[in-house]
Interface confidence: low
């Protein structure tokens, strides 16, 4: 990912779930024992502040040291602050842990802007509002960083939930989730419900409010409405998927579908925006502009640099179109579409100068590293990372912010031929170059 707009450096994710709870509908899928049902202890275990990501509480070491850890499906290292830093209220103190083991190996992770570096080790790790297990996991103890930690963000580390292929320093460093599944009977699946606020929160509200749920080992019925639709994981590195069609308010962008996945399309909870390849971004903005032409917005707004504000409570949501992404389905020549609202892609921000207004940033932006389905997408949906069956599921989130006319939607099936051709094949020679740009 282009790390200038990836968390934790970057423009942020919307906060806690103040959207509407939708009624449950009948799920058409068959039950799978041990994979679905109620995970009460894990519901509402995430918190987040607009612009600063979603984090879960974890404990590390013996006796346990409690830290808040950013949930990131776009990287694969478990890395925590392990030295004093002006932005950290607490950090992992290895010397106080009787179970810490030093791997005598360093790790250096450069970003487009900033970096972190540290020392590798292992220790006992658990998630208090997660499964009742303790595992020994690899930990990167961050000793130095630049533009990584965020002042006031309330998290002290990052939990990379993607695959070993993109782990640093190399793919021999087993990611946390792999360790968890290997050492326990927990099924190889997790699911995320990120709940955007829909409007800015002051600091007290943001800290006190719930931000969503990370369900480890299964699927919780109460977190979504309708049915789950699955798209294959194309390759196990990032959570890579294939987009086969894009529509703005039902109007097809009519581009070669390879453009949508150039050079990849990933689902990334550590990125704020819906990020689109240059050509796709330009076409999408042109279409969104046309659909919302009843009001004129400065170019800076469409570039994500400028806010637009309306008097509190009067945001004209309905002049903005819906955005639909069609994803490859599990059945040959079958796709399904996920549709997000302006309530997802206009990100609420606090504008101190005009605190009586509701102000927003346009949270669709340009990418040079493919499509990134960040929080803007994920906040509309309950997203199931079914690693065991190499697929990602989407259903309408029970906490997504919407209005009285439209809700986010997951609909299908649609007939789409030659979907395999939509995937971009990265030339081998380029791959190592691409990998140096992110965590």
């Amino acid at each position: 990912t282009h790390l200038g707009i990836r968390l934790p450096l970057r423009s942020g994710l919307a906060g806690p779930p103040l959207g509407l709870r939708l009624p449950r509908e009948t799920d058409e899928e068959s039950e799978e024992p041990g994979r679905r049902g109620s995970f009460v202890e894990m519901v509402d275990n995430l918190r987040g502040k607009s612009g600063q990501g979603y984090y879960v509480e974890m404990t590390v070491g013996s006796p346990p040291q409690t830290l808040n850890i950013l949930v990131d499906t776009g990287s694969s290292n478990f890395a925590v602050g392990a030295a004093p830093h002006p932005f950290l209220h607490r950090y992992y103190q290895r010397q106080l842990s009787s179970t810490y083991r030093d791997l005598r190996k360093g790790v250096y992770v450069p970003y487009t802007q900033g970096k972190w570096e540290g020392e590798l080790g292992t220790d006992l790790v658990s998630i208090p509002h997660g499964p009742n297990v303790t595992v020994r996991a690899n930990i990167a103890a961050i000793t130095e960083s630049d533009k990584f930690f965020i002042n006031g963000s309330n998290w002290e580390g990052i939990l990379g939930l993607a695959y070993a292929e993109i782990a640093r320093p190399d793919d021999s460093l087993e990611p946390f989730f792999d360790s968890l599944v290997k050492q326990t009977h927990i099924p190889n699946i997790f699911s995320l419900q990120l709940c955007g606020a829909g409007f800015p929160l002051n600091q007290t509200e943001a800290l006190a409010s719930v931000g969503g749920s990370m369900i480890i080992g299964g699927i919780d019925h109460s977190l979504y409405t309708g049915r789950l639709w699955y798209t294959p994981i194309r390759r196990e590195w990032y959570y890579e998927v294939i987009i086969v069609r894009v529509e703005i308010n039902g109007q097809d962008l009519k581009m070669d579908c390879k453009e949508y996945n150039y050079d990849k399309s990933i689902v990334d909870s550590g990125t704020t925006n819906l990020r689109l390849p240059k050509k796709v971004f330009e076409a999408a903005v042109k279409s969104i502009k046309a659909a919302s032409s009843t009001e004129k917005f400065p170019d800076g707004f469409w570039l994500g640099e400028q806010l637009v504000c309306w008097q509190a409570g009067t945001t004209p949501w309905n002049i903005f179109p819906v955005i639909s992404l069609y994803l490859m389905g599990e059945v040959t020549n079958q796709s399904f579409r996920i549709t997000i609202l302006p309530q997802q892609y206009l990100r609420p921000v606090e504008d101190v100068a005009t605190s009586q207004d509701d102000c927003y940033k346009f949270a669709v932006s340009q990418s040079s590293t493919g499509t990134v389905m960040g929080a803007v997408i994920m906040e509309g949906f309950y997203v199931v990372f079914d690693r065991a069956r190499k697929r990602i599921g989407f259903a309408v989130s029970a906490c997504h912010v919407h209005d009285e006319f439209r809700t986010a939607a997951v609909e299908g099936p649609f007939v789409t031929a030659d979907m395999e051709d939509c995937g971009y094949n990265i030339p081998q020679t380029d791959e190592s170059t691409l990998m140096t740009g992110r965590a």
Epitope: L18, F199, T294, G313, N318, D403, E404, R406
Partner: antibody
Amino acid sequence: QVQLVQSGAEVKKPGSSVKVSCKASGGTFSSYAISWVRQAPGQGLEWMGNIIPIFGTATYAQKFQGRVTITADESTSTAYMELSSLRSEDTAVYYCARSGGTKYGMLDVWGQGTMVTVSS
Amino acid sequence: EIVMTQSPATLSVSPGERATLSCRASQSVGSNLAWYQQKPGQAPRLLIYGASTRATGIPARFSGSGSGTEFTLTISSLQSEDFAVYYCQQLYTWPPRTFGGGTKVEIK
């Protein structure tokens, strides 16, 4: 300032249909929802459904599902509400109202109302 | 659907006095509530939205409060033109956007 002007009073026979129009003037029509609300004599307000002309799809209250059709014509800035299989209890004043499409969806501009009498 | 209950059905108040109208939701609607005023033979008029924000042109004597399931509309000093029926409406779930049964404010 947006104004909503509704069609005139109607007298209908049971089992027939009625179509009430609501013309918007003085402001944007397409991107704001038009809701229909009815009020039987001496009774309270009852929300029937709404439509956003730019999207064309209507949402209906369960009670009226299958009997009501809400449409809009962007070219004339007019919304329509058609109620079929009329019965005496459908005698009411039918209002159209605009919702600003905001976070709250309140009905901020109302038509003057159309009296529909269903009588044999 | 969410049921909105208004009380009292009728409120008798003298001009210049304070009137307090209540609206209760069968489940939490957050601050997603509006109040409307309706005079005989007229269409309703929006008074309050977002539970407490006055609509454009509404006098300051009208104020709304509450969140969740309990809401109040207060008219601090009743004027002759305020005698009317008042409705609350939940703006939280749909369809339908349910209204309360109304409170008639009459001259004592």
